[in-house]
Interface confidence: low
């Protein structure tokens, strides 16, 4: 049965979804267990010109010390104002000094990166040590690079399309996800549904997606259901500022009781099917409908509260 609900983009003042993901357009993770230098390469595309970027390097300490030096190769296509955090990491940074400006002195060894095409940059980096990870990111706002985390099965890194960087790299796109909404025809009342659909990633290991939900309305004003649909290997950790009905695939828990896993359901994996679930749950408004790549953290900010839906 077709559910009549014409999904249209919702104005940003009604709902915004940001997310952190390990999915990259191109990437690779390799193991270089005996290398004295751990090499990471980032190709960053900024389509709208000069940008700000927060780049954090995090070391997984072994016996209290970071055992290897790290070379980070930063290749950018336009001007970047960089906030770098790499506390206590013996870091060498290779970058184009005419394009990258630091928010504060980096306090690390720096090397000028030659103006090479991508393939040659990888070769240049590989001459300095085996590449542990490489990734191509489009318009990142922030990047977290975890050192010593590489668990790839590859012995060398070769860029491949649509890769999951696992725990090695997480990033947040600058552009929020497209949020759509609609009215469910023939359903009375003011119950609203927030639907988040997380698409399958390239690797299918167990994942927890943290979902932060912030709805700006008085607690008594809200009658809402949060529908979370994802691949079977995804479980959910929900951090919500309102009580609402929860309807998920896999298992979920709440941030206040993270140890208590609650079993979810097998939900449809199509937009139409999920709208049908919302209808079955007596929602009259789909206040937000979002489809995302496999993410680690998703933040939903909405101000609908069972009120009138405004689409842009």
């Amino acid at each position: 049965e077709t559910v009549h609900c014409d999904l249209q983009p919702v104005g940003p003042e009604r709902g915004e979804v940001t997310y952190t993901t390990s999915q990259v357009s191109k990437g690779c993770v390799a193991q270089a267990p005996n290398a004295i230098l751990e090499v990471h390469v980032l190709f960053l595309e900024f389509p709208t010109g000069p940008s700000q970027l927060e780049l954090t390097l995090q070391a997984s300490k072994q016996n209290g010390t970071w055992p290897r030096e790290v070379l980070l190769v930063l290749s950018v296509n336009s001007s970047v104002f960089l906030h770098l955090q790499a506390l206590g990491i013996p870091l060498h940074l290779a970058y184009n000094s005419s394009l990258v400006t630091f928010q504060e002195p980096p306090g690390v060894n720096t090397t000028e990166l030659p103006s090479f095409p991508k393939t040659q940059i990888l070769e240049w980096a590989a001459e300095r040590g085996p590449i542990t990870s490489a990734a191509e990111l489009n318009d990142p706002q922030s990047i977290l690079l975890r050192l010593g985390q590489a668990q790839g099965s590859l012995s060398f890194c070769m860029l491949e399309a649509s890769q999951d960087m696992g725990r090695t790299l997480e990033w947040r796109p600058r552009t929020p996800a497209l949020v759509r909404g609609c009215h469910l025809e023939g359903v009375a009342g003011h119950k609203e549904a927030h639907i988040l659909r997380v698409l399958p990633g390239h690797s299918a290991g167990p994942r927890t997606v943290t979902v932060k939900v912030e709805l700006s309305c008085a607690p008594g004003d809200l009658d809402a259901v949060l529908i979370l649909q994802g691949p079977p290997y995804v479980s959910w950790l929900i951090d919500a500022n309102h009580n609402m009905q929860i309807w998920t695939t896999g298992e979920y828990s709440f941030k206040i009781f993270p140890e208590k896993n609650i079993r979810g359901f097998k939900l449809p994996d199509t937009p139409q099917g999920l709208l049908g679930e919302a209808r079955m749950l007596n929602a009259s408004i789909v206040a937000s409908f979002v489809e995302l790549p496999l993410a680690s953290i998703v933040s939903l900010h909405a101000s609908s509260c069972g009120g009138r839906l405004q689409t842009s």
Epitope: P206, P231, P232, Y233, W247, K260, I262, R263, F265, K266
Partner: antibody, heavy 118, light 106 residues
Framework: EVQLVESGGGLVKPGGSLRLSCAAS????????MDWVRQAPGKGLEWVSE??????????YYAESVKGRFTISRDDSKNTLYLQMNSLKTEDTAVYYC?????????WGQGTLVTVSS | DIQLTQSPSSLSASVGDRVTISCRAS?????MHWYQQKPGKAPKPWIY???NLASGVPSRFSGSGSGTDYTLTISSLQPEDFATYYC?????????FGGGTKVEIK
């Protein structure tokens, strides 16, 4: 149409072993979370074990009463669920149902009777 | 483990009667599922997620409740409704069933 057909039940002595099978059809078996539920004569339902799909790394779960004695497994190429029961006790006497968990146990087999008696 | 206590354990009623079966959990659960079983047959899914009727279940059945108290109601008992009804939760490990409520003909 979803069909679950159990087999392998029978009479066995305490301490003995038995292997139950459940042949599945009418749905994508490899995507399904599959369970065994049992019912002792004249008693209520008791969950025994679950095995999840390949996408969930075929994770397995057991009731305390059978942990260490029973092993759940599956062969997705044969659309078949198994329950290997070792060190059987008289209290394991029951009808064993193969079930599919979706939002709840939405499909059940007809059951196979296991009798543990000397 | 979460214990589910069904009451009454059995009841006698006439066709047309309104029947209510209770399921109380020893601690709060998110959802309750209900199954119907007739003698010598496998259980059938009846109500899922507390209030949703499984496929083919007549609308005279309804489910309600939250927290620790859940109810299955038959608004007007029909001859085919005489059976045993079980509640079940899996909000917390392990999955548990209630002891069952047998609905008999008066």
């Amino acid at each position: 149409e979803v069909q679950l057909v159990e087999s392998g039940g029978g009479l066995v002595k305490p301490g003995g072993s038995l292997r139950l099978s459940c042949a599945a059809s009418g749905f994508t078996f490899s995507d399904a979370w599959m369970d065994w539920v049992r019912q002792a004569p004249g008693k209520g339902l008791e969950w025994v074990s679950e095995i999840r799909s390949k996408a969930s790394n075929h994770a397995t779960y057991y009731a305390e009463s059978v942990k260490g004695r029973f092993t759940i497994s599956r062969d997705d190429s044969k659309n078949t669920l198994y329950l290997q029961m070792n060190s059987l006790k008289t209290e394991d006497t029951a009808v064993y149902y193969c079930t599919r968990w979706r939002r709840f146990f939405d499909s059940w087999g007809q059951g196979t009777l296991v009798t543990v008696s000397s | 483990d979460i214990q589910l206590t069904q009451s009454p354990s059995s009841l006698s009623a006439s066709v047309g009667d309104r029947v209510t079966i209770s399921c109380r959990a020893s601690s709060s659960v998110s959802y309750m599922h209900w199954y119907q079983q007739k003698p010598g047959k496998a259980p059938k899914p009846w109500i899922y997620a507390s209030s949703n009727l499984a496929s083919g279940v007549p609308s005279r059945f309804s489910g309600s409740g939250s927290g620790t108290d859940y109810t299955l109601t038959i608004s007007s008992l029909q001859p085919e409704d005489f059976a045993t009804y079980y509640c079940q939760q899996w909000s917390s490990n392990p999955l548990t069933f209630g002891g069952g409520t047998k609905v008999e003909i008066k």
